[in-house]
């Protein structure tokens, strides 16, 4: 199957953008269905027959000249200049902008707390099946087995400490190797990535902020998996990981250090203890094959108990089960021996909503995800909403500017370096590269940051965690301080070998590169979005880790036509972009493939059908609640439905609609307010700080 | 307090079987195991086994398996012995004791039964 | 089977006296040993178990020590009552086994 859709005629052009999305086009002009509007323009438009509004299929061919989707949208400002204001309009603008920063700060708040809530939720949900993934013994020999079980019990688990310190727990108690654990450490490298792609969803609703917030939070992906895919087979040739970290963990005499601060945590925690709290031990403990552990609920009841150490009496089957000899005697009847017991009191219960309610772990965490997932999409949407209607004119300006420029030359290259030493920095302070990365997707979303910044942001992310993992790892008891401390630091040098690989020259900045295509892709068919969340980290790794438990036999016989097969459409492509002339007529294009192998259009159409029944009921409901809301508020204009909805209102009142390129699907108050869609009454009441 | 009685003798013919009873009271019958215990002037003390009432699970001296049958009956709190095939080797005084609780000491013991195996 | 063996059959002591009577198992047997008073015409009665605890009601010139093969039960201050059969017993495992005795006798 070709690896890139739609790809017609091949010509030597690495700025086509593929996928019909937005972008530079071929310039052929198509029939009648040409246009002249660009973005954000009201130049007059052709009208077409209307497409079916819940197809997810372009509405029209892109027009000739359309600028760069890449290039950050400019936010205008609709405001009252600040020197243009009376004293009171000055006051009133200061109390506005105040109020925008607390609600900022107490959307950001409950969106970080959110995504804790979402990682219990999915360690309640999946977490016991993750903890049976790691007690298979085929692991210790085969790599690939390790990865995938490193990406799925962290795409479960939603968190990549959780799946590390199993992993060191693991290899404490001589159930696995180091060499062993590495694949599960890169695997849980991919699997940490999806938490802001999974953020990045939340932002569908506009196509040209979608494109971007996808792509951003995409390129983590392609940089853990293309880091995964060159570094893996390098590890098993060579095990430099193992050799480098054993040596540094033999030259030092480390003593235990002191626990890594948790600064985050200390705001977060009060609220999310009051949601749930979870007994994290449970998935180690299955982890480690401990059957009772298989039976005792996530969901921590007791909060406060005392431990007592003591000896006491108890049978054994015969005298070899007795601790010593001379521990050992008999009643007449049962052999008795003495064990030191250590036996837990309960004494004060948790204080969380779930405490009393003894439900299932599946029940809680099913209740959790839907509840985390939709606080999170609420205070992503407000935030992207605040950000909005703050990021404009001049803020914005010098916002952009300092985020996004480069040192002057001839230090340029030294730019991309601080940023990596500011997503570590700032991975370190919020001790989770997930909620960083998550907090960056809306802002990359919006345009406030390019890829192009955000990619060196997410290295410094992924180096930050490690660093996290290695205190951590030195605050351990005695027995796990060498095995936690070389994992971490086989973490850690896993990153720094990924980011010499696809940095330093901006030539291998292939993540980037990736991600913008698939963000291209996810613009037009948002439901490929869903599908490659899907793929890339449920399928796949679900697939290798059947054909693993299968046996090497299989996993060769599956595996190798499936790789011969991808190198050959890669270089086939690298052929057809390059130099066609070396190939064969027929092999210049895909068009010797059937239209499903070359495109998604045929796929869109199967999944528009699909989800046009339910994409109906959707925005019925949608119309209903805006209309409501109106009422409410005592305006006609204030509140929008989603595109889809009002095509379908507009479709069903029998208009004709003047089609719109994919760009101009905003929903934001700034682009109204800059196409006059919002009234001027409403602008007076937005202020800006220059 | 804590009692155990026996009858203090038995007569019975060489070849013949005795039931021995030990009736208890001033505890709780099934949370002690039984002990039973052969005095003989030439061989001392000799354990030939014991009951757990509460489950019935016994425990015979390898020497005493199939000479001695242990039994219980709760409703009655008292514990009995069947010794059968008897020969002139089994003349002795017959103990029933109470085992302390997770171990083989037994704390109380009953006044001995006499077994006289003539013809 | 584990021996105890209780190498005085008799012992001769004044009332007053500290009298000291040992008992050897074949085997280790860790403190799982008690010891046991029978006057004559009565049953046997507990006076330590564990090698070293007292049965309850038991009087403190009675002790006992030792642990694993070697064990000793003391009557510190002999009283004219104290004359009778004393056994050791071992339960570090089945069957239970009982030491031959030693008789105490008032000189």
């Known amino acids: 199957m070709a690896p890139w859709p739609e790809l017609g005629d091949a010509q030597p052009n690495p700025d086509k953008y593929l996928e019909g999305a937005a972008g530079q086009q071929p310039t052929a002009p198509d029939k009648s269905k040409e246009t002249n509007k660009t973005d954000n323009t009201e130049a007059p438009v052709t009208k077409i027959e209307l497409l079916p509004s819940y197809s997810t299929a372009t509405l029209i061919d892109e027009p000739t000249e359309v600028d760069d989707p890449w290039n950050l949208p400019t936010l205008q400002d609709s405001g009252i200049k600040w020197s243009e204001r009376d004293t009171k309009g000055k006051i009133l603008c200061f109390f506005q902008g105040i109020g925008r920063l607390i609600l900022l700060l107490g959307f950001l708040y409950f969106f970080v707390c959110s995504l804790d809530i979402l990682s219990s939720a999915f360690q309640l949900v999946g977490g016991k099946m993750a903890g049976q993934f790691f007690s298979n013994s085929s692991i210790m020999s085969n790599p690939l087995l390790g990865l995938v079980i490193g990406v799925l019990v962290t795409v479960l688990v939603q968190s990549s400490s959780t799946s590390t310190s199993i992993v060191v727990s693991m290899v404490s108690s001589s159930l696995l190797t180091v060499r062993a654990a590495i694949p599960i450490i890169m695997g849980a490298n991919i699997g940490t990535s999806i938490t802001n792609t999974i953020v990045a969803l939340m932002q569908v609703g506009d196509r040209s902020e979608f494109r971007r917030a996808f792509a951003g939070a995409t390129v983590h992906d392609f940089f853990n998996w293309l880091s995964v895919l060159v570094l893996l087979p390098v590890e098993v040739a060579t095990h430099y990981l193992e050799i480098i970290t054993q040596l540094i963990v033999e030259s030092f005499h480390f003593k235990n250090g002191e626990d890594a601060p948790d600064l985050l945590k200390v705001i977060t925690k009060p609220f999310t203890k009051l949601i749930v709290q979870l007994d994290k031990k449970v998935i180690s403990q299955i982890a480690m094959n401990d059957e009772k552990a298989k039976n005792k609920s996530l969901v921590k009841i007791w909060c406060k108990t005392f431990t007592n150490k003591t000896q006491i009496n108890v049978t054994v089957p015969s005298t070899a089960n007795c601790t010593s000899p001379s521990l050992c005697w008999t009643d007449g009847i049962q052999n008795w021996t003495m064990k030191n017991v250590t036996y837990k009191e309960n004494i004060a219960k948790c204080q969380h909503i779930f405490v009393n309610f003894h439900l299932p772990d599946l029940a809680v965490g099913t209740i959790l995800l839907i509840l985390s997932l939709l606080v999170l999409c609420g205070c992503l949407i407000m935030i992207v909403k605040i950000l909005g209607s703050v990021l404009k004119g001049q803020v914005a300006t010098v916002i952009k500017k300092t985020i996004n420029t480069d040192f002057p030359f001839p230090f340029a290259w030294l730019t991309g370096y601080l940023a990596i030493l500011v997503g570590a920095g700032m991975t370190f302070i919020v001790q989770s590269s997930s909620v960083f990365t998550s907090a960056l997707t809306p802002l990359i979303g919006i345009g406030v940051i390019t890829i192009e910044r955000a990619y060196p942001l997410t290295l410094g992310s992924n180096i930050g965690t490690t660093t996290t993992a290695i205190l951590a790892a030195l605050a351990s008891p005695g027995n796990a301080l060498r095995s936690s401390l070389q994992i971490a630091l086989c973490h850690f040098f896993f990153n720094i070998s990924g980011i010499l690989l696809w940095y330093p020259i901006p030539f291998t900045r292939l993540p980037i590169r990736m991600a913008k295509g698939l963000g291209n892709i996810s613009a037009k068919y948002r439901w490929f979005a869903v599908f490659y969340l899907i793929i890339f980290f449920f399928l796949i790794p679900l697939t290798v880790f059947g054909l693993s438990l299968a046996g090497w036999r299989v996993l060769v016989g599956v595996g190798v036509p499936v790789v011969f097969i991808i190198i050959l459409v890669l270089c086939l492509r690298l052929l057809q972009s390059r130099c066609p002339r070396v190939l064969p007529k027929k092999l210049q294009n895909w068009n010797f493939l059937p239209l499903w192998m070359r495109s998604l259009k045929p796929w869109d159409a199967v999944v528009s059908k699909f989800t046009g029944c339910f994409q109906m009921r959707c925005c019925c409901c949608c119309r209903v609640c805006c209309r409501a809301c109106c009422l409410l508020c005592d305006c006609p204009k204030c509140c929008r439905c989603s595109k889809c909805c009002e095509d379908l209102e507009e479709a069903q009142e029998g208009q004709d609609v003047p089609v719109k390129a994919p760009e101009t699907f905003d929903n934001i108050t700034i682009s109204r307010e800059a196409q006059g869609e919002v009234p001027a009454s409403d602008s007076k009441t937005e202020c800006t700080a220059l | 307090q804590v009692q155990l009685q026996q009858p203090g003798a038995e007569l019975v013919k060489p070849g013949a079987s005795v039931k021995m009873s030990c009736k208890t009271s001033?505890?709780?019958?099934?949370?002690?195991?039984m002990h039973w215990v052969k005095q003989t002037p030439g061989q001392g003390l000799e354990w030939i086994g014991a009951?757990?009432?509460?489950?019935?699970?016994?425990a015979y001296n390898q020497k005493f398996k199939g000479k001695a049958t242990l039994t219980a009956d709760k409703s009655s709190s008292t514990a009995y012995m069947q010794l059968s095939s008897l020969t002139s080797e089994a003349s002795a005084v017959y103990y029933c004791?109470?085992?302390?609780?997770?171990?083989?000491?037994?704390?109380?013991w009953g006044q001995g039964t006499s077994v006289i195996v003539s013809s | 089977d584990i021996v105890m063996t209780q190498s005085h059959k008799f012992m001769s002591r004044s009332v007053g006296d500290r009298v000291r009577i040992t008992c050897k198992a074949s085997?280790?047997?860790?403190?799982?040993v008690a010891w046991y008073q029978q006057k004559p015409g009565q049953s046997p009665k507990l006076l330590i178990y564990?090698?070293?605890t007292r049965h309850s009601g038991v009087p403190d010139r009675f002790t006992g020590s030792g642990s694993g093969t070697d064990f000793i039960f003391t009557i510190s201050n002999v009283q004219s009552e104290d004359l009778a059969d004393y056994f050791c017993?071992?339960?570090?495992?089945?069957?239970?086994?009982f030491g031959a005795g030693t008789k105490l006798e008032l000189k």
């Open positions: 085997q280790d047997v860790g403190t799982a």
């Open positions: 001033g505890y709780t019958f099934t949370t002690n195991n």
């Open positions: 564990w090698a070293t």
């Open positions: 009951i757990y009432p509460g489950s019935g699970a016994t």
């Open positions: 017993q071992q339960y570090s495992s089945n069957p239970l086994t």
């Open positions: 004791a109470r085992g302390m609780y997770g171990h083989g000491a037994m704390d109380y």
